[in-house]
C-alpha cells in the first residue's frame, strides 16, 4: 500500500492521522499557526510529510475550496525558475521572478503568490496516510 519512490502517488490509502484531512489518496495538514518557509518545511518533514506539492490544476482547484484569504506556504521555491520540492517545474509559470530576496510560493483561495521566504504564514503539509510511504 502506498509504496514506491519518495515522489510517487499514494493509491487506495486508508484514513489520515488526527488533525489531517483526507482528500483523494492523500492526507493534508492545514496549520493554525504561522512560520517562515524553512520552519514550515521542517514541521512537515518531522511528520514524514512535505510541504504541499500540487500535481495538477484539479488538485489546486479542489484544495482552494478549503483555503481562505490567508496565505499558506507550499512546497514551491524560485531558484532560477519556479520549482516544486519534488524537482518538477511550475508548468504554468515559465518566467523567473528576479527579486533581491529569496522567493517562495504561497497559496490562498485566490491562487499562487510569490513571497519573501522569511514571512510567517500558515502552511500545508501533504503525505500518504502511513508515515514511511510516498510523500507526493
Amino acid at each position: 500500500l502506498c509504496q514506491g519512490s519518495n515522489y510517487s502517488t499514494c493509491a487506495s490509502c486508508p484514513s489520515c492521522p488526527d488533525r489531517w484531512m483526507k482528500y483523494g489518496n492523500h492526507c493534508y495538514y492545514f496549520s493554525v499557526e504561522e512560520k517562515d518557509w524553512n520552519s514550515s518545511l521542517e514541521f512537515c518533514l518531522a511528520r514524514d510529510s512535505h510541504l504541499l506539492v500540487i500535481t495538477d490544476n484539479q488538485e489546486m482547484s479542489l484544495l482552494q475550496v478549503f483555503l481562505s484569504e490567508a496565505f499558506c506556504w507550499i512546497g514551491l521555491r524560485n531558484n532560477s525558475g519556479w520549482r516544486w520540492e519534488d524537482g518538477s517545474p511550475l508548468n504554468f509559470s515559465r518566467i523567473s521572478s528576479n527579486s533581491f530576496v529569496q522567493t517562495c510560493g504561497a497559496i490562498n483561495k485566490n491562487g499562487l503568490q510569490a513571497s519573501s521566504c522569511e514571512v510567517p504564514l500558515h502552511w500545508v503539509c501533504k503525505k500518504c496516510p502511513f508515515a514511511d510511504q510516498a510523500l507526493f
Epitope: Q64, S93, S97, N110, Q113, A114
Partner: antibody, heavy 116, light 108 residues
Amino acid sequence: QVQLKQSGPGLVQPSQSLSITCTVSGFSLTTHAVHWVRQSPGKGLDWLGVIWSGGNTDYNAAFISRLTISKDNSKSQVFFKMNSLQADDTAIYYCVRLLLPAMDYWGQGTSVTVSS
Amino acid sequence: QIVLTQSPAIMSASLGERVTMTCTATSSVSSTYLHWYRQKPGSSPKLWIYSTSTLASGVPVRFRGSGSGTSYSLTISSMEAEDAATYYCHQYRRSPYTFGGGTKLEIK
C-alpha cells in the same frame, strides 16, 4: 529586471471611463498579484483594487461599483477600467506588483486629468 | 478600515541631524505588514523599509524602522541631502490596504 509599464490617456472627459494597460516583465502574473493605487493631491495614496494570480479580484468598497480589473497572463498585461470619472478622480494611477509581504515594484504612473 | 496617521506632516532637518518620523494606526497592525515607501517629486513610490524594520535593497544603513502594535517609526541616524523626500507608511494586513498621509522631509 522587474518592470511595470503603463499606457493610457492623460485627459478624460467628465462621466467618461478611464482605461489603463499595465504590461509587466521580469515576473509572471501566474505567481504575483497586481494592485492598483492612485495618488491625488488632496487625498494622498488610495488603494483601489487587486487582481490575484488566479484571476479573482478584490476592490476597495468605495470604488467597487465603477471599477473593473482584468488580465491576460499570456501577454503579461493587466487592464484597469474605471467608469463615470469626475473631477476628483484626477490623480496619478499606479499598477504595483505584490511580493509578500509588500507591494514592491510600482509602475511609472499614469497621470489622469478629468476635465472638459 | 485601518487609518494610518503620520507625524509630522512636514519637517526639516540639517545635514547630519538625527531624524525620526512616526506612524500611528487606529488598530493593531502586524509588524510583518507595516511598510515604508519613499517618494521623490516626479517619481513613483519606492519600497524603502518592509516588515517594520527590514531595509529594502539599496537602502542605506542609516535608515532604521521600528515599532509594534499601533505605533511605528522611521529613523535616519544622520540626515543626508539625498534623504529629502516624502515618506509614507502602509499597512498590508487588512483590506482596504491603507497608506499614511506622508511625512515630507526637507533640508534645513
